[in-house]
C-alpha cells in the first residue's frame, strides 16, 4: 500500500493531499508544493518536505518565527528545486537569479553566484553529527540505555537501518548521534541519513511530520529525555568550496 487504505492518509507525511485515485482505487498521496507522488511506507525526501513547507500558507504555521537577529542553520528555509526522484538539484537559485550549489541534504556548499554558476554533481553528505543538549535531570542517563534507546528510535520511527547509526556519544548533558552512509552502502529502499536527520530535527522541535502519530516522547527507562537545543553538522564526501573571504 502506498498510503493508509482505511481513511486514505499518508502516515509518514502529513504535508500531502491524498485521494483514492491510484490503480484499482488505491489511495495515492502527493506532496504539497510539488504535487509529486510520495511513497507513504517510508520517509519523504527532505527536498519535497522543504518545498511543501514553503508552499504552506503563512498563517498555517504554528510556531512563531524567530527575530531577524536569530541565527539559523546556514541559510535556513528556502524553496528548493527537486529532481524527479525528489532529491535536491545540485544547483539552487532564488527568484533574483542568485544561485549556489548544495549537498544531498540541501545545505549550501559554495559561495553564492549568478546563473552562470555550475554545479556538476550533487555531492553526497555521508556523515551527519547530531549534537543535542538535554534538560537537567536528577542524574545522568545510563549511557548504554540511552545509546540503545536512540538506536531503537532511528530504526522504529525513521526506518533507518541500524548499520547507519555509527555511534552515540554521551557526556552529560551533551548527546551526539553520528549517522554515516556512503553512496556505496546505500541500497535501494534504504532511508537516507539526511531524511532521517531532518525528521528527527522536526520531531525534536515539536513539529512532527508524521500523520496521526503522537509527537516524539523520548524516554530512557521511563525517564523523559527533553532536548533543549540541537545542532546538526553535515560532512560531505567532497569538501565544500567556499572562498577564503567567507572563512575569515
Amino acid at each position: 500500500h502506498t498510503a493508509a487504505q482505511d481513511n486514505c492518509t499518508c502516515p509518514t507525511n502529513k504535508m500531502t493531499v491524498c485521494s483514492p485515485d491510484g490503480p484499482g482505487g488505491r489511495c495515492q498521496c502527493r506532496a504539497l508544493g510539488s504535487g509529486m507522488a510520495v511513497d507513504c511506507s517510508t520517509l519523504t525526501s527532505k527536498c519535497l518536505l522543504l518545498k511543501a513547507r514553503m508552499s504552506a500558507p503563512k498563517n498555517a504555521r504554528t510556531l512563531v518565527r524567530p527575530s531577524e537577529h536569530a541565527l539559523v542553520d546556514n541559510d535556513g528555509l528556502y524553496d528548493p528545486d527537486c529532481d524527479p526522484e525528489g532529491r535536491f538539484k545540485a544547483r539552487q537559485c532564488n527568484q533574483t537569479s542568485v544561485c549556489w550549489c548544495v549537498n544531498s541534504v540541501g545545505v549550501r556548499r559554495t559561495d553564492k553566484g549568478d546563473l552562470s554558476l555550475r554545479c556538476d554533481e550533487l555531492v553526497r553528505t555521508h556523515h551527519i553529527l547530531i549534537d543535542l543538549r538535554h534538560r537537567p535531570t536528577a542524574g545522568a542517563f545510563n549511557h548504554s540505555d540511552l545509546d540503545a534507546e536512540l538506536r531503537r528510535l532511528f530504526r522504529e520511527r525513521y526506518r533507518l537501518h541500524p548499520k547507519f547509526v555509527a555511534a552515540v556519544h554521551y557526556e552529560q548533558p551533551t548527546i551526539q548521534i553520528e549517522l554515516r552512509q556512503n553512496t556505496s552502502q546505500k541500497a535501494a529502499g534504504d532511508v537516507d541519513i539526511g531524511d532521517a536527520a531532518y525528521y528527527f530535527e522536526r520531531d525534536i522541535k515539536g513539529e512532527s511530520l508524521f500523520q496521526g502519530r503522537g509527537g516524539l516522547d523520548l524516554r530512557v527507562r521511563g525517564e523523559p529525555l527533553q532536548v533543549e537545543r540541537t545542532l546538526i553538522y553535515y560532512l560531505d564526501e567532497i569538501p565544500p568550496k567556499f572562498s577564503m573571504k567567507r572563512l575569515t
Epitope: Q5, A148, R151, H161
Partner: antibody, heavy 117, light 106 residues
Framework: EVQLVQSGPEVKKPGASVKVSCKAS????????IGWVRQAPGQGLEWIGE????????YYTQKFKGRVTMTADTSTSTAYMELSSLRSEDTAVYYC??????????WGQGTLVTVSS | DIQLTQSPSSLSASVGDRVTITCSAS?????MYWYQQKPGKAPKLLIY???TLQSGVPSRFSGSGSGTDFTLTISSLQPEDFATYYC?????????FGQGTKLEIK
Amino acid sequence: EVQLVQSGPEVKKPGASVKVSCKASGFTFTDYVIGWVRQAPGQGLEWIGEIYLGSGTIYYTQKFKGRVTMTADTSTSTAYMELSSLRSEDTAVYYCARGSIFPFDYWGQGTLVTVSS
Amino acid sequence: DIQLTQSPSSLSASVGDRVTITCSASSSVSYMYWYQQKPGKAPKLLIYDTSTLQSGVPSRFSGSGSGTDFTLTISSLQPEDFATYYCQQWSSYPYTFGQGTKLEIK
C-alpha cells in the same frame, strides 16, 4: 540465505548459569541486531533484550537486568546469551532473532533450557 | 511497559471461515507486528507496519488498525493456518507481545 543456528538443549541445576549461542550466516553480521526471546512451556513469547552487533550496544529488560549477559563474537558471527542464577521458572525455549528495520525478521530454531534439581 | 491484550485467547474455526483476531495496546503504538507460530517451531513474521504482508505470506492474511486497536484477519482459513498468532510492538522499550491466540480446527 539468512540463517541463525542455535546451540543444543541444556539441562541445568537451580543457581547455575547457561550460555546459549546463535551462529549467523547469509548476511553481514555487524550490520544488524540480535534480539533474544524466550517461551516457557505452553506460554507466550517474552522479550529479554537485544545487542547491536556493530557497536556492542545492549538493552536488557528490567526483569532480566543483572542476570543476563549478551555478547557477540564478530570473528565467528556468533551471538551469545548467558543467564545466571537459574531457577525453575527459567525453563523455556530461548530464541535468537535478527533485527533490522523490523524488530525480528529471521529467527533461530530455539534452544530448550531445562532447570531442574 | 505497553501491555498488549489479544482476543480471543483461543478460537475454533473451520476451513474456509473468515477469522478476526484483535490486539489492544495499553497506550498508543505506531505500528503492530503479527507472528504465526506452529508447535515446536520458531515464530514467523506475517505482517509488519500494521498492514504490510511479509514476503511469501498469502494475501488471505491482512492487518489493520491504529493507535491502540489492531486487527489480524484471515479471509478464508486454510488447513495450514491453524497455529498460534501473536501481536507485538516496538514503539517503546521493552518490546512486548500479546499473550497469543490459538486457532484450532472445529
